[in-house]
Amino acid sequence: SKLKDPELSLKGTQHIMQAGQTLHLQCRGEAAHKWSLPEMVSKESERLSITKSACGRNGKQFCSTLTLNTAQANHTGFYSCKYLAVPTSKKKETESAIYIFISDTGRPFVEMYSEIPEIIHMTEGRELVIPCRVTSPNITVTLKKFPLDTLIPDGKRIIWDSRKGFIISNATYKEIGLLTCEATVNGHLYKTNYLTHRQTNTIIDVQISTPRPVKLLRGHTLVLNCTATTPLNTRVQMTWSYPDEKNKRASVRRRIDQSNSHANIFYSVLTIDKMQNKDKGLYTCRVRSGPSFKSVNTSVHIYDKAFITVKHRKQQVLETVAGKRSYRLSMKVKAFPSPEVVWLKDGLPATEKSARYLTRGYSLIIKDVTEEDAGNYTILLSIKQSNVFKNLTATLIVNVKPQIYEKAVSSFPDPALYPLGSRQILTCTAYGIPQPTIKWFWHPCNHNHSEARCDFCSNNEESFILDADSNMGNRIESITQRMAIIEGKNKMASTLVVADSRISGIYICIASNKVGTVGRNISFYITDVPNGFHVNLEKMPTEGEDLKLSCTVNKFLYRDVTWILLRTVNNRTMHYSISKQKMAITKEHSITLNLTIMNVSLQDSGTYACRARNVYTGEEILQKKEITIRDQEAPYLLRNLSDHTVAISSSTTLDCHANGVPEPQITWFKNNHKIQQEPGIILGPGSSTLFIERVTEEDEGVYHCKATNQKGSVESSAYLTVQGTSDKSNLE
């Protein structure tokens, strides 16, 4: 038979009471029933009491009395009584409800949002409710769009309902903004604020925040966190599909994070306890917002027990090169759960050995590789809780590009010069891993290039490989190799001995291994000039004579040879170029520049310098010669000739020493006849001495010497007496 509706003690659809009063409401029905109450009433424990009793004829009816002490404005709402366990089809007929207004002059609105506006999501064209319901149906409420617009209810598009608020039947973008419900009670203005947001269906991003694929041990708990990011005005529905969905294995928790001022973040967390093999497979998080849809999935693997397998990724012996920015030493590891990883180098923890060693997953990263990084590397893998341990060792060889020791230590900016004809020893000491081989090459200088560096004009010429029997360039005495320990390292020293230095060129030693090649150029310039630079003065001239200077430089080391005169003017040394220079003469090993100044005067005295530019350093080198031109002076005799007697057949010397500038020329006379050198009569150095061998009677007479130069002459005479008898008759 049809149940009669439950009956409420207060009749009608609504009832008004004052705040602070007690609400008594009885429900009488033909079956057991329950109350449905406003949210704020349901939360009351102290004020609310519900008592059940049997009532009516013969106690056959069910009664329930609701008592709400000191009712408050926010208890306003629907109070309904409905039968328990009634088929769905009859639900409408088995419920009685009344809307109770709990009037409070100090609180016209049931929900007050004065400090922080309530956010209402709207969709254009749909109904929008501004839920500023009131505590009394008699309150007049105005709806404003802040600050200047009033939205006036017209009974059609905008309707006022004191139980719901303002109902806007088809909202437009014009309703987006700060909407305020205003009510004036007893001269007081009350406001409750709402922010309307246009609802969109944009899903920015969906992610499962767990590594992919997910790996778990059987019996453990699976937690998958799905995150959907949307604009502030979007709402989403999030669902999961998973292997054992039919048994509802999973529990799902949802939450929303609205703390971000630019986006909403929705979370859906799926949890399955005690994972079994049937739970392995694809887990999909589906996110829907209106017509928009996005999904993301992840694979879940279940393992029965912990395991580790480790293999060499390539071979057991690995090679790298010193100087590499970064080298990754890695092993092929399969393991679950993730093992603890420790790398050892030669038995000691690698990362403790050097800050250049970094562990990344199952790899060891070596930063800025050096040859000290060579050694045995062991990966230790451990899953301690399951007592599973594995290790594997690899050997790392660090190859080093050859380096030539002499190249590093040489501080000479320009090449050495080798004396012509000398024996020379050239050495190259190389280091590298593997041990480099050293080869020698000869590169001749092109003699046409007198103005250029030999090693600059080498492009087109060939280099010749050398051995001890080579006949290219200079004669080679030997080429030998030996090991030498330098700075604690085994280095290969190769020595080339040049037997006879004759030809200028470049000796090149090349050190090679599989990493690379390095070369050292030894400029081998022959010099026939001491130190490669020499200035020569023929003789210091006197006024009126010629000044003759020559400058010889090594042609491979110097260029731009010129003579200059240095003069000091106001404490500053001035360089004057000399116009009287001849062309430089280029020879096999050197360049000579002669300077001749004819008929010099005293003013030609000064510091003469030969200037040349070092081809290698660009530096200008000067070699100076101080020249003092002497004043002319008439000859004068240091001692006059004096008469003397000499024994026949003996010898005699007559001295005529004269000074003067230029040095006087001495002329001898006997009895006014000029004496010429002939057998038995010898004129000494500069004719200053007259030496007569085996004096005869004919040699007796007046001897006369005359010293002459441009300034004049001086004379002296003496009588030579020959004493004794001639042997001539005897000889005849």
Epitope: P117, F146, P147, L148, D149, Y173, L178, L189, K191, L195
Partner: antibody
Framework: EVQLLESGGGSVQPGGSLRLSCTAS????????MNWVRQAPGKGLDWVSS?????????YHVDSVKGRFTISRDNSKNTLYLQMNSLRAEDTAIYYC???????????WGQGTTVTVSS | QSVLTQPPSASGTPGQRVTISCSGS????????VNWYQQIPGTAPKLLIY???QRPSGVPDRFSGSKSGTSASLAISGLQSDDEADYYC???????????FGGGTKLTVL
């Protein structure tokens, strides 16, 4: 780009009149309430007038300008106006045209136009 | 005399936190929301905070606003030299039916 451009400022004698204009661009002019705010030399900001979206019901003025100033708008021209009559020396200021934010406050300001009232 | 009351000046050193207060009455701050504006000398004001505490996009999170009863305050943390400006609070006033502003606070970064 949302922009407000004021014009019509200038010098006028006390008792004179001026009409300020503000041309809006970069947004749907008719959907927003608009305001005039002024700033006397070396002083703070003072609200002058406001007008609602449609420009029919709600116009508001500060007491000191009531009966002298009138705010109006022409939505078809995207222009806001301030008709200023019976000007006084104390009306000397930079006048800013401002747009109401969707939710609260004035989110866009013009660069201002200067009004000088002196004899 | 401004309807809302602000201190005429405030100062702080770079990196410091500075707070500017604004007090009003029930008809303005008490019953309405507060906005804050920044005005760099020679330029138009700029909206800094709306709805008591919301920042428009582009305003750094160093700026924060709050309201309690009939008072509001603006806090600037990690003070920078380019924060030197005049700061104004504003609210709607139900009695005057219009906007009211504070007198402005000149912030100096020492």
């Amino acid at each position: 780009e949302v922009q407000l451009l004021e014009s019509g400022g200038g010098s006028v004698q006390p008792g004179g009149s001026l009409r300020l204009s503000c041309t809006a661009s970069g947004f749907n002019f008719e959907d927003y309430g608009m305001n005039w705010v002024r700033q006397a030399p070396g002083k703070g900001l003072d609200w002058v007038s406001s007008i609602n979206r449609q420009g029919d019901i709600s116009t508001y003025h500060v007491d000191s300008v009531k009966g002298r100033f009138t705010i109006s708008r022409d939505n078809s021209k995207n222009t806001l106006y301030l008709q200023m009559n019976s000007l006084r020396a104390e009306d000397t200021a930079i006048y800013y045209c401002t747009k109401n934010h969707d939710y609260h406050g004035m989110d866009v300001w013009g660069q201002g136009t200067t009004v000088t009232v002196s004899s | 005399q401004s309807v809302l009351t602000q201190p005429p000046s405030a100062s702080g050193t770079p990196g410091q936190r500075v707070t500017i207060s604004c007090s009003g009455s029930r008809s303005n701050i008490g019953n309405n929301f507060v906005n804050w504006y920044q005005q760099i000398p020679g330029t138009a004001p700029k909206l800094l905070i709306y709805l008591n505490s919301q920042r428009p996009s582009g305003v750094p999170d160093r700026f924060s606003g709050s309201k309690s009863g009939t008072s509001a305050s603006l806090a600037i943390s990690g003070l920078q030299s380019d924060d030197e400006a005049d700061y104004y609070c504003a609210s709607w006033d139900d009695s005057l039916n219009g906007w009211v502003f504070g007198g402005g606070t000149k912030l100096t970064v020492l």
